[in-house]
Amino acid sequence: HSDGIFTDSYSRYRKQMAVKKYLAAVLGKRYKQRVKNK
């Protein structure tokens, strides 16, 4: 079993955290926009 076949669990964790951060930023931006538009 070559290491290259797999993405290791830490790399997957980092990607998940990056996605979470991105979504939080996008959703936060949308929320601020909605508040501003009211």
């Epitope: 079993h1 290491d3 797999f6 290791d8 669990s9 830490y10 790399s11 997957r12 964790y13 980092r14 955290m17 951060k21």
Partner: antibody, heavy 117, light 112 residues
Framework: QSVEESGGRLVTPGTPLTLTCTAS????????MIWVRQAPGEGLEYIGF??????NTYYASWAKGRFTISKTSTTVDLKITSPTTEDTATYFC?????????????WGQGTLVTVSS | DIVMTQTPASVSGAVGGTVTIKCQAS??????LSWYQQKPGQPPKLLIY???TLASGVPSRFSGSGFGTEFTLTISGVQCDDAATYYC??????????????FGGGTEVVVK
């Protein structure tokens, strides 16, 4: 590059104690850090870890509520919330390389905590 | 939490001989397992990670194998300096296993 634990001492049961892991020559925000303990003559017991980048913490089931891991820009702290005599051990911190998947290559020498009345 | 079971608890090997230590995980951890050597009064030293990759500066007489739940550490051509306690550690972190990285109970290697 090194990590060093400090803060170990003799405490009475129930007295909270905070241990500190200080990193030299490394930016803690790039690494996963774990705390491990070893009672006299016993094996290694995993406590928990903090992703020093985002501050997320995770604990072994037995350690939840008994320990709190936190960080500053240069240190990672382990608080023993209400020590009992069973918490007498040498406490180690270790750094992932950079995460956990490649094991933990950098360890401190440990700090001894003795809990006794 | 994942449970790591190491066998035997103690093993004796002759200088120049071969010693084998086994580690079993309670669920699949793929190849994300490391091995450490610890001598009295010292912190653990990383020997092998990703089940079979030798850490920097570790002699080639140490080797690791395994995948999933069964893993082996082999010391070929045992030397006096190899007398120590050896630990395996899970390094497979997922939300499901709560990112917990436990150790096996340890194996004491006595060199004759």
């Amino acid at each position: 590059q090194s990590v060093e634990e400090s803060g170990g001492r003799l405490v009475t049961p129930g007295t909270p104690l905070t241990l500190t892991c200080t990193a030299s020559g490394i930016d803690l925000s790039s690494y996963a850090m774990i705390w491990v303990r070893q009672a006299p003559g016993e094996g290694l017991e995993y406590i928990g870890f903090i992703d020093a980048g985002d501050g997320n913490t995770y604990y072994a089931s037995w350690a939840k509520g008994r320990f709190t891991i936190s960080k500053t820009s240069t240190t990672v702290d382990l608080k023993i919330t209400s020590p009992t005599t069973e918490d007498t051990a040498t406490y180690f911190c270790a750094r992932g390389d950079p995460g956990w998947s490649n094991g933990f290559a950098l360890w401190g020498q440990g700090t001894l905590v003795t809990v006794s009345s | 939490d994942i449970v790591m079971t190491q066998t035997p608890a103690s093993v004796s090997g002759a200088v120049g001989g071969t010693v084998t230590i086994k580690c079993q995980a309670s669920q699949s951890i793929r190849n994300e397992l490391s091995w450490y050597q610890q001598k009295p009064g010292q912190p653990p030293k990383l020997l092998i990670y990703k089940a079979s990759t030798l850490a920097s500066g570790v002699p080639s007489r140490f080797s690791g194998s395994g995948f999933g739940t069964e893993f082996t550490l082999t010391i070929s051509g045992v030397q006096c300096d190899d007398a120590a306690t050896y630990y395996c550690q899970n390094n497979y972190g997922t939300r499901r296993n709560n990112y917990v990285f436990p150790f096996g109970g340890g194996t004491e290697v006595v060199v004759k």
